[in-house]
């Protein structure tokens, strides 16, 4: 950056190089150029010469004043007009930053995604700080009282192998940057209570032409958790409101759920699961679309699918999966 240049003088910022956004700041430039009594001192911000709020303090020093500085980053440098020099002479440069102290981290959440081998901890960092902000995640065993600390810039994945202090832990997060430090409340966790089952996937749909046509949704998961509670939500694509069905599920075979839907309408389905009685849900699965026929039966599928663990039977049809911005991970 600009800070790596060879200086013929000195540039400094008051109150500091990193300061609170919206502050008034002063940038000082002091020339120390051999055989040069500067006629004029110039300031540049991001390569553009500043024209206003420059005050000459003495023969070698000038000040640039900014009111309510709101830029997160700027590269400043100053130059001197020396007698007998055609070009301005570079004095020095400095990168400056403005931002905010961190908010108190809240909504600290730790989950173990089944088979991941990690405990993933996240939190709400609050408002954007604009400056480099680091987080220290503290994990303290309630059994051994041993504490481990993990430094990160956002969330953290902690290998479950490193959690050797039993099953119960306290977790809290410290946020720190050049402008301040804050600490979250402590979260108490039990490792057995924070497991999120392997993702549930809707594989295909078919509408059976009967007296009252019914749509069967086939869905599955890799989970080996025995007691799993799931929700399937569905709506016509033209609707805003979701309908939700709840299921107690054992994924030893592909699940089949029946719906009585309106004919000739495009529906969208999503599923999510949690270990029964536990706190955290999976994110909603990818959107799965199925258009009900007017009268003729129809099958919709993402792929060919084994109907049980060992059967080898497959059902062929059309792919319809889509990713969506509505796939928010509301695990709370």
């Amino acid at each position: 950056g600009i800070t790596n240049i060879n200086c013929s003088g000195h540039i400094w910022v008051e109150p500091a190089t990193i300061f609170k956004m919206g502050m008034n700041i002063s940038i000082y430039c002091q020339a120390a150029i051999k055989n040069c009594q500067p006629r004029k001192l110039h300031f540049y911000k991001n390569g553009i010469k500043e024209r206003f709020q420059i005050t000459r303090i003495n023969k070698t020093t000038a000040r640039l004043w900014y009111k309510n500085f709101l830029e997160p980053h700027a590269s400043m440098y100053c130059t001197a007009e020396c007698p007998k020099h055609f070009q301005e002479t570079l004095i020095c440069g400095k990168d400056i930053s403005s931002g905010y102290p961190p908010d108190i981290p809240d909504e600290v959440t730790c989950v173990i995604y089944e088979y991941s081998g990690n405990m993933t901890c996240t939190w709400n960092a609050g408002k954007l700080t604009y400056i480099d902000t680091k987080y220290v995640v503290h994990v303290k065993s309630l059994e051994t009282e041993e504490e481990q600390q993990y430094l990160t810039s956002s969330y953290i994945n902690i290998s479950t192998d490193s959690l050797q202090g039993g099953k119960k832990y306290l977790v809290w997060v410290q946020a720190a940057n050049a402008l301040g430090m804050e600490e979250s409340k402590q979260l108490q966790i039990h490792l057995d209570d924070i497991v999120i089952p392997s993702a549930a996937v809707i594989s295909r749909a078919e509408t059976i032409n009967a007296t009252v046509p019914k749509t069967i949704i086939y869905w599955d998961s890799q989970t080996t958790i025995e007691k799993v509670s799931c929700e399937m939500r569905y709506k016509a694509t033209t609707n805003q409101t979701w309908n939700v069905k709840e299921f107690d599920t054992n994924f030893t075979y592909v699940q089949q759920s029946e719906f009585y839907l309106e004919p000739n309408i495009k529906y969208v389905f999503q599923v999510r699961c949690q270990e029964t009685g536990k706190r955290y849900w999976q994110p909603w699965s990818s959107l799965f679309f199925h258009k009900t026929p007017e009268t003729v039966p129809q099958v919709t599928s993402k792929a060919f699918q084994h109907d049980t663990w060992n059967s080898g039977l497959t059902v062929a049809s059309i792919s319809t999966g889509h990713l969506t911005s509505d796939n928010r991970g509301d695990i709370g």
């Epitope: 998961s221 990818s286 699918q305 792919s319």
Partner: nanobody
């Protein structure tokens, strides 16, 4: 259609080694995670190991430091190197995969038929 075919099972003495392979074929755009599970008669299905597309791995405690999962993305194949085998490892070993069959991100779960591993 996507098929997963396991091979490499057999009878081995306690303390011995086996290497299982599982090859996926068919309409495959991309395979994300690949897994090994096992099931002994009268027991629940048990997860053994998982490997991500980027080769991140995780293992069940019961096999950690004895089994190694690996994969060859170009061949759509996953392997399970099993060392220091114990009678308690006797089971049918299944591989499974989270497969994208198209470019739109839709994932589907596929499972193999399994291969018998017997440790005497």
């Amino acid at each position: 259609e996507v098929q997963l075919v396991e091979s490499g099972g057999g009878l081995v003495q306690a303390g011995g080694s086996l290497r299982l392979s599982c090859a996926a074929s068919g309409t495959i755009f991309r395979i994300e995670n690949m897994y090994w599970f096992r099931q002994a008669p009268g027991n629940q299905r048990e997860w053994v190991a998982r490997i991500s597309r980027e080769s991140g791995t995780s293992y069940a405690d019961s096999v950690k430091d004895r089994f190694t999962i690996s994969r060859d993305n170009a061949k759509n194949t996953v392997y399970l190197q099993m060392n220091s085998l114990k009678p308690g490892d006797t089971a049918v070993y299944y591989c499974t995969a989270d497969v994208q069959t198209n470019s739109r991100g839709a994932q589907q779960i596929f499972r193999g038929q399994g291969t018998q591993v017997t440790v005497s």
